[in-house]
Interface confidence: low
């Protein structure tokens, strides 16, 4: 009888854990949807305002090939850096190639000197894999130097010509990126 009761109790506990997990997933999903909604709104506003002036990038953004970059004049923690890029219809910088890395680091040298800038790279808490915001993995030459011994969430940032890692709750400048508008000729 006692064994039966404890089995039922364990089953109930397992059910509770599953429900908590589902609730947590739903909360994450809801937050993600809210951010995506804001991104879409910002993107629409951005597209409309850009349609009026035909330059490929907004004021204060730098152009390189098909991308526009915004180097922040304020600093914030990684999560809020991403939110602020979303608000501008962009995302945190995703470095696709060494050429792009060279352009970014060269531009930063001219603009600001040797500061820390968040990019859209974070470490998956479970697997320890580095991931860009779109879920893709960085190319081997663009993995952050192992610098952070933090037990907290770890995110990637650019400093001078290096890609480094740090606790996501530290405050840094950040770089946003979005597609440049094609001029309609």
């Amino acid at each position: 009888k006692l064994l039966q009761v404890s089995t039922i109790a364990m089953q109930q506990q397992e059910k509770l854990i599953q429900q908590e997990r589902a609730l947590l997933n739903f909360t994450e999903w809801k937050r993600s949807c809210a951010l995506q909604m804001k991104y879409c709104q910002a993107f629409m506003q951005n597209s409309l305002s850009s349609a009026h002036n035909s330059s490929p990038c907004p004021n204060n953004w730098i152009q390189n090939r098909e991308s526009c970059y915004y180097v922040s004049e304020i600093w914030s923690i990684w999560h809020t850096s991403q939110e602020n890029c979303l608000k501008e219809g962009s995302t945190l910088l995703q470095i696709e190639s060494k050429e792009e890395m060279d352009f970014i680091t060269g531009s930063l040298r001219k603009i600001k000197g040797s500061y820390d800038y968040w990019v859209g790279l974070s470490q998956d808490g479970h697997s320890g894999r580095w991931l860009w915001q779109d879920g893709s993995s960085p190319s081997p030459g663009l993995l952050p130097a192992e610098r952070s011994q933090s037990a907290n969430q770890v995110c990637g940032y650019v400093k001078s010509n290096s890609l480094l890692s740090s606790n996501c709750s530290t405050w840094k400048y950040f770089i946003c990126e979005k597609y440049a508008l094609r001029s309609s000729v």
Epitope: I74, T80, E83, K87
Partner: nanobody, 117 residues
Framework: DVQLVESGGGLVQAGGSLRLSCATS????????TGWYRQAPGREREFVAQ????????YYADSVKGRFTISRDNARNTVYLQMNNLKPGDTAIYYC??????????WGQGTQVTVSS
């Protein structure tokens, strides 16, 4: 003219509580994200807590997690920091700030918090 005015600091015994307020004026409060920093004598100013503009997500320094709570009231243009279970190590001047993309960041004058053991 943008102004951030902190209040609520004071002297409290270890284990006690304080609630800091930061009243802002001259900015569109709801589009700024706001945070608290602190600076102890002879140390760098350090991040304490922040609340985002978009969905009231909150972020905390590890040293205050579980003890401090940041909140904001957009109707009153005010951000709060509820500090519980205070420790002597929390003694510092606490500053409130407001910032947004492409704009400057604004700071208050600070309010002194002293925790005695």
């Amino acid at each position: 003219d943008v102004q951030l005015v902190e209040s609520g600091g004071g002297l409290v015994q270890a284990g006690g509580s304080l609630r800091l307020s930061c009243a802002t004026s001259g900015l569109t409060f709801s589009s700024y994200y706001t945070g608290w920093y602190r600076q102890a004598p002879g140390r760098e100013r350090e991040f304490v807590a922040q609340i985002s503009w978009s969905d009231d997500s909150t972020y905390y320094a590890d040293s205050v997690k579980g003890r401090f709570t940041i909140s904001r009231d957009n109707a009153r243009n005010t951000v709060y920091l509820q500090m519980n279970n205070l420790k002597p190590g929390d003694t510092a001047i606490y500053y409130c700030d407001a910032r947004k993309v492409g704009g400057p960041d604004y700071w208050g004058q600070g309010t002194q918090v002293t925790v005695s053991s």
